[in-house]
């Protein structure tokens, strides 16, 4: 009855502060409307990073000011988080909700630990 959500355990952000990972869910039914939310868990506090609702077969659209972008293919969502800095290192949880048609299902991933290393400043050249 529970919906399983899979995501990688660890991802290393690029030097430009970009991290990408796949969030895959095992849909118990034929959902047409899906909500995907990325949550950040730090010190047992959970906050929303970004969220998008999409119709199956359509593109995933985050708000214009969102730090996330993504694409969907079947029961798989490819998520990209941008603008990350070392202080953003933490556990990023993929949450999937099958909003329509009934019944509603909730799926929570185990989280992806994203490591962000701020790039060293370039040394001054003579």
């Amino acid at each position: 009855k529970a919906m399983h959500v899979a995501q990688p355990a660890v991802v290393l952000a690029s030097s430009r502060g970009i991290a990408s990972f796949v969030c895959e869910y095992a849909s118990p039914g034929k959902a047409t409307e899906v909500r995907v939310t990325v949550l950040r868990q730090a010190d047992s506090q959970v906050t929303e990073v970004c969220a998008a609702t999409y119709m199956m077969g359509n593109e995933l659209t985050f708000l214009d000011d969102s730090i996330c972008t993504g694409t969907s293919s079947g029961n798989q969502v490819n998520l990209t988080i941008q603008g990350l800095r070392a202080m953003d290192t933490g556990l990023y949880i993929c949450k999937v909700e099958l909003m329509y048609p009934p019944p509603y299902y909730l799926g929570i991933g185990n989280g992806t630990q994203i490591y962000v290393i701020d790039p060293e400043p370039c040394p001054d050249s003579d």
Epitope: M3, L39, M99, I108
Partner: antibody, heavy 118, light 108 residues
């Protein structure tokens, strides 16, 4: 701090209607799904209805389907429950509750009592 | 619909004793989707445990949750006077959202 305050309860005759409201404050209302849960006197908790972030998706318990309507106004941070064709079995304290990020009902209002009696 | 059955209906214990409350589901519930609530007379329910074993903010560590599949447990290691109340389990993984019928923990 997060606050949910219900209002609109009272005594109503069987077959009549009542409208409950829940005023939300202290959080970004549109970012959370919401529920109504009720509790008959001396009884346990019964989930009544759910509404999605934008109000487009609604779910109801079989016991209220076709009689109750949930809605929300994200611009006013308000959740509403329209109750029609009330019966004595609908007598209960009605709570609005917020869905936490990970799914449980993390904040509840203080409840409003609805009594259906002739 | 997932039916949750709690046992016992009433638990009579003294302060300082250990309380063990059970919640059994009619079908498998992912451990991420099981919560426990506490309710005192005249008050709204309060979230204690979510995800079967994670304590909600501000909940003392004498409360702990465990279990998976269809069998879940709430344990209060040492009962304090303020812990005497009714406890409900809930599944929130799929609609309809359902609650157990409650276990009353009363003073012996």
């Amino acid at each position: 701090q997060v606050q949910l305050v219900e209002s609109g309860g009272g005594v109503v005759q069987p077959g009549r209607s009542l409208r409950l409201s829940c005023a939300a404050s202290g959080f970004t209302f549109s970012s959370y799904t919401m529920h109504w849960v009720r509790q008959a006197p001396g009884k346990g908790l019964e989930w009544v209805t759910f509404i999605s972030y934008d109000g487009n998706n609604k779910y109801y318990a079989d016991s209220v389907k076709g009689r109750f309507t949930i809605s929300r106004d994200n611009s006013k941070n308000t959740l509403t429950l329209e109750m029609n064709s009330l019966t004595p079995e609908d007598t209960a304290i009605y709570y609005c509750a917020r869905t936490g990020w990970l799914g449980p009902f993390d904040y509840w209002g203080q409840g409003t009592l609805v009594t259906v009696s002739s | 619909e997932i039916v949750l059955t709690q046992s016992p209906g009433t638990l009579s214990l003294s302060p300082g004793e250990r309380a063990t409350l059970s919640c059994r589901a009619s079908q498998s519930v992912g451990s991420s989707y099981l919560a426990w609530y506490q309710q005192k007379p005249g008050q709204a329910p309060r979230l204690l445990i979510y995800g079967a074993f994670s304590r909600a903010t501000g909940i003392p560590d004498r409360f702990s949750g465990s279990g998976s599949g269809t069998d879940f447990t709430l344990t209060i290691s040492r009962l304090e006077p303020e812990d005497f109340a009714v406890y409900y389990c809930q599944q929130y993984g799929s609609s309809p959202w359902t609650f157990g019928q409650g276990t009353k923990v009363e003073i012996k």
